[in-house]
């Protein structure tokens, strides 16, 4: 293979263009100058290089920038970004939101890859904080990114970003995160009418307080059991049997199947058995007739 290391006569690349797709791997290695590639990276995205050819181009950039690519190159990587490893990306210093957007665009429509996660981490660390513009960008590309943020970080999420969130994007959010996101969702959707509002707010209800659940029970929303089971236990406990019946509508029958699971189990324990019996579902475990219910938490607060 020694004779193949020199660039054949007349094949030296003067610019990055489509003629290079006809080069063999060794010809690309021998005939493309890394500095030329770095200055004309923006052209690569329009040209259909094979994966093997992209490997060669990446190798050339790696040799030129062993400590990590400069942002001027990173911004124009295009689909060559898909060839980068998290280890490569950890060497980068990305500070421009335009660079972040350009690379997120390359991965658009796909799940967040380890490369993208590393890129975002590098970007946020470089900026020192999650400012509104960054969050707007990240939630636009990855609404599910919200659930990877701490409650403290979520506090700076603008309500406008909530519009991009799909129900499945909140699947991995824990109650502490929903506590922060729910008021923002409530604000974002406040001008919608009853049924439309419920459709949008439904996936955020794991952060809703009791008073909001009571209000929803007056609006014939027919909450499904899956949503009910994700509500905060402390928000469900004060609801009366009548309020839960109104909240769930025809789905109230599903309580029987969930009577051993929180929050239904804990809620049943707080209700009078007489009231539970009015549902006709055979729910057991309520407070027997004639017993006095003392709210010890209220008593402690008073003493």
């Amino acid at each position: 293979e020694v004779e193949k290391t020199a660039c054949p006569s007349g094949k030296k690349a003067r610019e990055i263009d489509e003629s290079l797709i006809f080069y063999k791997k060794w010809e690309l290695e021998a005939c493309v100058d890394a500095a030329l590639l770095a200055t004309q990276m923006d052209r690569v995205n329009a040209i259909p290089f094979t994966y093997e050819q992209l490997d060669v181009l990446k190798h050339k950039l790696d040799e030129l920038y062993p400590q990590g690519y400069p942002e001027s190159v990173i911004q124009h990587l295009g689909y060559l970004f898909l060839k980068m490893s998290p280890e490569d990306i950890r060497k980068w210093n990305v500070t421009s939101l335009e660079t972040l957007k350009a690379l997120l665009e390359v991965n658009k429509g796909h799940e967040m890859s380890p490369q993208v996660a590393t890129l975002i981490d590098r970007f946020v660390k470089g900026r020192g904080q999650l400012d509104k513009d960054t969050l707007d960008t990240l939630t636009a590309f990855y609404p599910g990114y919200l659930c990877s943020l701490s409650p403290e970080e979520l506090s700076s999420v603008p309500p406008s970003s909530i519009w991009a969130v799909r129900p499945q994007d909140l699947d991995t959010c824990d109650p502490r995160q929903l506590d922060v996101l729910y008021p923002k969702a409530r604000l974002a959707f406040q001008n919608m009418n009853g049924s439309e509002y419920f459709v949008k707010i439904q996936s955020f209800l794991g952060g809703a307080p009791t008073e909001d659940l009571k209000a929803l029970s007056q609006q014939n929303v027919s909450m499904d059991l899956a949503t009910f089971m994700k509500l905060r236990t402390d928000a469900v406990l004060p609801l009366t049997v009548a309020e839960v019946q109104k909240l769930l509508g025809p789905h109230v029958e599903g309580l029987k199947a969930e009577e051993r699971h929180r929050p239904v189990r804990d809620w049943i324990l707080r209700q009078r058995q007489d009231d539970l019996d009015t549902l006709g579902l055979g729910l057991q475990g309520g407070i027997p007739n004639g017993y006095l219910v003392l709210d010890l938490s209220m008593q402690e607060a008073l003493s």
């Epitope: 489509e18 797709i21 995205n45 329009a46 040209i47 259909p48 295009g78 689909y79 898909l82 390359v106």
Partner: nanobody, 112 residues
Framework: QVQLVESGGGLVQPGGSLRLSCAAS????????MAWFRQAPGKGLEAVAS????????IYADFVKGRFTISRDNSKNTLYLQMNSLRPEDTAVYYC?????WGQGTQVTVSS
Amino acid sequence: QVQLVESGGGLVQPGGSLRLSCAASGRTLESYVMAWFRQAPGKGLEAVASINWSSGRLIYADFVKGRFTISRDNSKNTLYLQMNSLRPEDTAVYYCAAGRYWGQGTQVTVSS
């Protein structure tokens, strides 16, 4: 996103002809170079011909010069490859590509 769908492959005798089509949908193609690649059994991908959608520049691999013609129809957003004087060594899966986007390929078999 760009979706590319090739068609027109098949079985043909040596010396025969075929015309491959590649229908593109999604985003506009003006900013892309489009090309035909092929992969013979047990071999790597190789570029056959390319066309720069904006400038119209055509390039052919040496092994198809004078036999194959690449063309496009802007109104139909379609790329073509007219293959004449086909040889057994042209047997391969032919792929259409535009920038980072690739089609699924169409099989061309040249055999008597």
